[in-house]
């Protein structure tokens, strides 16, 4: 039994190492955002015993704008550091709980399905505002991500359900 792709969370990305039951994955707030204090980036693939269907738990994560980064220009993309994701000091304790992040609060919400990200409507003659955001999924090719502002994603061929051949970059883990 495996989980489908996890829900998208506004202003956050996710790298899924495994879709297996009881797998735990973390969302990472996008560049320019940080985890709101008291919210958790963790999601777990669990089984609904009533329906025998696996699903990801809903993370309480809220990614809020990081005032410290408001006036900084994002780093130009490169093959090593693309997104400039700000690492959050968030780790799992043996109990499975994570420490609260020491960040100011705000009211960004996590979407229950695909996140609706603020952005301008595209018109052929207009340039909308920036504001990079994304969503992701699974069932792709396989690989090892590369280093960004935090540490490398630790992924081996056996650790993921992705078919061989695809490599992520520009993403940082926050375990």
């Amino acid at each position: 039994i495996t989980c489908p792709p996890p829900m998208s969370v506004e202003h956050a990305d996710i790298w899924v190492k495994s879709y297996s039951l009881y797998s735990r994955e973390r969302y990472i707030c996008n560049s320019g955002f940080k985890r709101k204090a008291g919210t958790s980036s963790l999601t777990e693939c669990v089984l609904n015993k009533a329906t025998n269907v696996a699903h990801w738990t809903t993370p309480s994560l809220k990614c809020i704008r990081d005032p410290a980064l408001v006036h900084q220009r994002p780093a130009p993309p490169s093959t090593v550091t693309t997104a400039g994701v700000t690492p959050q000091p968030e780790s799992l304790s043996p109990s499975g709980k994570e420490p609260a992040a020491s960040s100011p609060s705000s009211n960004n919400t996590a979407a229950t399905t695909a996140a609706i990200v603020p952005g301008s409507q595209l018109m052929p003659s207009k340039s909308p505002s920036t504001g990079t955001t994304e969503i992701s999924s699974h069932e792709s090719s396989h690989g090892t991500p590369s280093q960004t502002t935090a540490k490398n994603w630790e992924l081996t061929a056996s650790a993921s359900h992705q078919p061989p051949g695809v490599y992520p970059q520009g993403h940082s883990d926050t375990t």
């Epitope: 792709p5 996890p6 998208s8 969370v9 202003h11 956050a12 990305d13 996710i14 790298w15 899924v16 969302y27 990472i28 996008n30 560049s31 994002p74 993309p77 693309t82 997104a83 400039g84 994701v85 399905t113 695909a114 996140a115 609706i116 990200v117 603020p118 952005g119 301008s120 409507q121 595209l122 018109m123 052929p124 909308p128 505002s129 920036t130 504001g131 990079t132 955001t133 994304e134 969503i135 992701s136 999924s137 699974h138 069932e139 792709s140 090719s141 690989g143 991500p145 993921s160 992705q162 695809v166 992520p168 970059q169 520009g170 993403h171």
Partner: nanobody, 126 residues
Framework: EVQLVESGGGLVQAGGSLRLSCAAS????????MGWFRQAPGKEREFVAR???????YYAESVKGRFTISRDNAKNTVWLQMNSLKPEDTAAYYC????????????????????WGQGTQVTVSS
């Protein structure tokens, strides 16, 4: 509805470089993950690279270290910089937009993409 228009394809010698562009209109560009796929004659369409709404990137093993995907939400454009091209890179290259899974870095099935461009041909001669 999002319209995607690719450009930048052409004929290049092995070892050369090309930069493909994909211009989007008709939707909220920053709400999509963008991907590049390619299809050689007689072969299935295959994943090349993906950039999430958070600008995180993901590459097929066959292009890792040679191709770079990037996006500019202000210009509603995604690029694919292709260096050290090989004859086996010859294919029609397609740009695609994925809204539902815009924040998923390593999710690349063709079925997750909502919109596709018409493609641009890249031919690498030996």
């Amino acid at each position: 509805e999002v319209q995607l228009v690719e450009s930048g394809g052409g004929l290049v010698q092995a070892g050369g470089s090309l930069r493909l562009s994909c211009a989007a209109s008709g939707g909220t560009f920053s709400s999509y993950a963008m991907g590049w796929f390619r299809q050689a004659p007689g072969k299935e369409r295959e994943f090349v690279a993906r950039v999430t709404w958070g600008a995180n990137t993901y590459y097929a093993e066959s292009v890792k270290g040679r191709f770079t995907i990037s996006r500019d939400n202000a210009k509603n454009t995604v690029w694919l910089q292709m260096n050290s091209l090989k004859p086996e890179d010859t294919a029609a290259y397609y740009c695609a937009a994925d809204r539902k899974y815009a924040g998923h870095i390593n999710y690349t099935p063709l079925t997750s993409y909502d919109y596709w461009g018409q493609g641009t041909q890249v031919t690498v001669s030996s």
